[in-house]
């Protein structure tokens, strides 16, 4: 469960890879689209709203048995979108939504060497946003493999 | 409740290595973090590294680089730091804390443990 | 590596004061700040994270703000437990730093 219904604390960055591609969204037929490229030089990074939240989580509800207090994170690049995870279709898409948000739009957040992040759905443990073929796809990342692939790895700068 | 206990008191002399383990209870071990931080006499604190308990990956602060070793025990929920090739300015309080997120290094260290002296000296 | 400044060094207060000892971080981060209570002899005490959450347990008359480069402990009404050394510490990226620490004592 979600301690409180208000973040602790927000911040705007912009997103990148681990290998230093941007995450830019653009507005397509009325609907965002996500993109992972490379920037040109003089172009501005998109920036995404994050705001963080407290969880108590219950090992049981874990794919690695980890119980406690955990950091979770919505993420928003525009005025009432936010990411959300499409577990069925393993992908990860902008959806306009009011509070309060579903657990769709909820990520822990776990910090990783060379201050690198990645996103784990709330919905589904074990699963984490991804790249994959230049868009952000939902990743089933195995526990033994020290989640150290760099597909899952993000750089947040502000 | 939450506790971290510390191995007691070390005098080791310059070129030596010390181990100080940190015993935790009260919490599942491998779900948190955890950083030792040290406090030479009169002076402030400093980072010296961290462990996940989770995995037992790594990170250390360069200055340490290369002579300190963190470990973990989750069989006994055991904490290890090892420093080695002491010198006199390792005399210092060496403090194992315990990250307050699960996942995260953001929210710092809720718990600490009592402290252990480690003196150099010849 | 982010470096640390905490003002002042030292602070006399008396019972009753309003305290407040501000941290400069020599780069900005967002708001993953943490303020610590020690007492001699002892290890720290966790006060507030998040620059601004009150730690479970801490009295009410501690607070944070403050966000980027610039973060504030204020003690609104100093107790004569309250007469310790305080640091901050950034939590933002690796290497974690602490401020060199701000001694509130007895006037």
């Known amino acids: 469960s979600i301690t409180g219904i208000s973040p602790i604390t927000e911040s705007l960055a912009s997103l990148s890879t681990y290998n230093d591609q941007s995450i830019t969204f653009a507005l397509e037929d009325e609907s965002y689209e996500i993109y992972v490229e490379d920037l040109k030089k003089d172009k501005k990074k998109d920036k995404v709203l994050l705001s963080y939240y407290e969880s108590q989580h219950p090992s049981s509800e874990s794919g690695d048995g980890v119980d406690g207090k955990m950091l979770m994170v919505t993420l928003s690049p525009t005025k009432d979108f936010w990411l959300q995870a499409n577990n069925k279709e393993h992908s990860v898409e902008l959806h306009k939504c009011e509070k309060p948000l579903p657990d769709q739009a909820f990520f822990v957040l776990h910090n990783r060497s060379f201050n690198c992040v990645s996103f784990e759905c709330k919905t589904d443990p074990g699963v984490f946003i991804g790249v994959k073929d230049n868009h952000l796809a939902l990743i089933k990342v195995d526990y033994s493999e020290n989640l150290g692939s760099e597909n899952i790895l993000f750089k947040l700068s502000e | 409740q939450v506790q971290l206990v510390q191995s007691g008191a070390e005098v080791k002399k310059p070129g030596a290595s010390v181990k100080v383990s940190c015993k935790a209870s009260?919490?599942?071990?491998?779900?948190?973090?955890i950083s030792w931080v040290r406090q030479a006499p009169g002076q402030g604190l400093e980072w010296m590294g961290w462990?996940?308990?989770?995995?037992?990956?790594?990170h250390y602060v360069q200055k340490f680089q290369g002579r300190v070793s963190m470990t973990t025990d989750t069989s006994t929920s055991t904490a290890y730091m090892e420093l080695r090739s002491l010198r006199s300015d390792d005399t210092a309080v060496y403090y194992c804390?315990?990250?307050?997120?699960?996942?995260?290094?953001?929210?710092?260290?809720?718990?600490w443990g009592q402290g252990t002296l480690v003196t150099v000296s010849s | 590596d982010i470096q640390m400044t905490q003002s002042p060094s030292s602070v006399s207060a008396s019972v009753g004061d309003r305290v407040t000892i501000t941290c400069r971080a020599s780069?900005?981060?967002?708001?993953?700040l943490a303020w610590y209570q020690q007492k001699p002899g002892k290890a720290p005490q966790l006060l507030i994270y998040?620059?601004?959450s009150l730690q479970s347990g801490v009295p009410s008359r501690f607070s944070g703000s403050g966000s980027g480069s610039d973060f504030t402990l204020t003690i609104s009404s100093l107790q004569p437990e309250d007469f310790a050394t305080y640091y901050c510490?950034?939590?933002?990226?690796?290497?974690?730093?602490f401020g060199g620490g701000t001694k509130v004592e007895i006037k």
């Open positions: 998040a620059a601004s």
């Open positions: 510490q950034q939590a933002n990226s690796f290497p974690l730093t």
């Open positions: 804390a315990r990250h307050s997120y699960t996942t995260s290094w953001y929210g710092g260290f809720d718990y």
């Open positions: 780069q900005g981060f967002s708001s993953w």
């Open positions: 462990i996940s308990s989770h995995n037992g990956n790594s």
């Open positions: 009260g919490y599942t071990f491998n779900s948190y973090g």
